[in-house]
């Protein structure tokens, strides 16, 4: 296309632009580290920072983790996009009783209208079923079992919802994790993980469980709830959620009815050895950002030891004195070797003693 040649030539003379043959246009060249939001960016605002998979760019221009909808009671409403988080909502037949940012912390099954009541507004992912008294003189047809259950707590406009559990009768008719079904009997066999600090000094006939909720008459829609800081695992046991109480850990996801709390190393640290739902050993992230390196080039020829910063702080990237030595107490499994032309060891202190209360393994 000869008519495009002059336009193409004008791009060649401008280092901030390039010619895209596919669209036959001059396009703005995004600076290093930024990526185009469209095929042929025209201006700097068409470039953006690129986040890793399952992260999005928030309003403060930070890469932030998208929420996960991996719990059994959640479904994805909107996917994780470059500039917005994934959004989760309660699965059909349930509503959100405790909301969370872009998700729901606790889903409950929609209430069943008791005898003498009919559905005024069906339940949604956000709201429970709203019941109203049936018209005078009209009894429920009982064609739908939903309208033939006994009231759970008197005749009220909205019956008390039931927390979702794989062990409830309602849940046991639905596939749970990989298509398996948890039988109701599992609820009677609930046990707790040993020695969880959360249950110390709490006498209970069945440790790890809260007192049994009374079932609404004529309904099996109830379950034994685990104590606070316990979750119902896939085998139907109450298991202690891991603790993120170590100084080098922060909570990533909370302890939910059917999933453990998860912990991760605090910012500026990296997980050197993982543990179930947590990190057994966090170490300060050993590589400084490129722009913070202050080591003069001529020092690259010398053997230099970098001392680890205090727990949780970033390495300052400044070399210690030339003959500085690593602390004698550093054990072999606690350090990372820094190798940038010369051999430089970075002793890494271990984190606080590992005391995870997840499954007693």
């Amino acid at each position: 296309f000869p008519q495009d040649r002059p336009f193409e030539d004008t791009c060649h003379g401008n280092p901030s632009h390039y010619y895209d043959k596919a669209v036959r246009r001059c396009c703005y060249r995004c600076p290093m580290g930024l990526f185009p939001t469209q095929q042929c960016p025209q201006r700097p605002t068409d470039c953006r920072k690129q986040c890793e998979p399952d992260y999005y760019l928030d309003e403060a221009d930070r890469c932030t983790a998208c929420v996960t909808c991996s719990r059994d009671d959640l479904v994805e409403k909107t996917p994780c996009a470059w500039n917005s988080s994934r959004v989760c909502e309660c699965r059909p037949g349930m509503f959100c009783s405790t909301s969370a940012v872009n998700s729901c912390a606790r889903c409950f099954f929609h209430s069943v209208c008791p005898a003498g009541m009919i559905v005024k507004f069906p339940g949604t992912a956000q709201k429970n079923t709203v019941c109203e008294p049936a018209s005078p003189g009209v009894s429920p047809a009982c064609a739908s079992p939903e309208n033939c259950k006994e009231p759970s707590s008197g005749t009220i406009p909205q019956a008390k919802p039931t927390p979702v559990s794989p062990a409830t009768s309602s849940a046991s008719t639905m596939p749970v994790r990989g298509g398996t079904r948890l039988a109701q009997e599992a609820a009677s066999k609930l046990t707790r993980a040993p020695d969880s600090p959360s249950s110390v000094g709490r006498p209970s006939s069945d440790p790890g469980l809260s007192p049994t909720q009374p079932c609404p008459e004529g309904s099996g829609d109830c379950r034994k709830q685990c104590e606070p800081d316990y979750y119902l695992d896939e085998a139907g046991r109450c298991t202690a959620c891991v603790s993120c109480s170590r100084d080098d850990l922060v909570e990533k996801t909370p302890c939910a009815w059917n999933s453990s709390r998860t912990c991760e190393c605090r910012p500026g640290m990296i997980c050197a050895t993982s543990a179930t739902n947590s990190c057994a050993r966090c170490v300060p992230y050993p590589i400084c950002a490129a722009e913070t390196v202050t080591k003069p080039q001529d020092m690259a020829e010398k053997d230099t030891t970098f001392e680890a910063p205090p727990l949780g702080t970033q390495p300052d990237c400044n070399p210690t004195p030339e003959n500085g030595e690593a602390p004698a107490s550093t054990s072999p499994t606690q350090s990372l070797l820094v190798d940038s032309q010369a051999s430089k060891t970075l002793p890494i202190p271990t984190s606080a003693p590992v005391a995870l209360s997840s499954t007693g393994k």
Epitope: Q50, Y55, E264, C265, C271, N277, I287, D339
Partner: nanobody, 122 residues
């Protein structure tokens, strides 16, 4: 989505060598640090080595002097040269993108790729 594909694993005798490769898409490759993690049977996910975008490298004590990490930005690939292999190096090896951000929890094994199995046995 960024995909990481690890390869190069296999069965090797103690003292032998292997070279692992991790290929990824060009879209984000030349910016972030890259790392190798490994997970031995029944063990947790363990940090092995990190390489920064400008080539600075870090090694866990258990592999220093034996393993060498490198990257070729033009091929969008990071490598792990493993020499003097020992039985305790037997594990599935995974590469991880931008460990500073993505490897704060214990989930940098099998985060993107399937890993490559290294078995050291006589």
């Amino acid at each position: 989505e960024v995909q990481l594909v690890e390869s190069g694993g296999g069965l090797v005798q103690p003292g032998g060598s292997l070279r692992l490769s991790c290929a990824t898409s060009a879209f984000t490759f030349d910016g972030p640090d890259m790392a190798w993690y490994r997970q031995a049977p029944g063990k947790g996910c363990e940090l092995v080595s990190i390489i920064s975008a400008d080539g600075r490298t870090y090694y866990a004590d258990s592999v220093k002097g034996r393993f060498t990490i490198s990257r070729d930005n033009s091929k969008n690939t990071v490598y792990l040269q493993m020499n003097s292999l020992r039985a305790e190096d037997t594990a599935v090896y995974y590469c991880a993108l931008d460990p500073r951000k993505n490897c704060r929890g214990g989930y940098c094994c099998a985060n993107w790729g399937q890993g490559t199995l290294v078995t050291v046995s006589s």
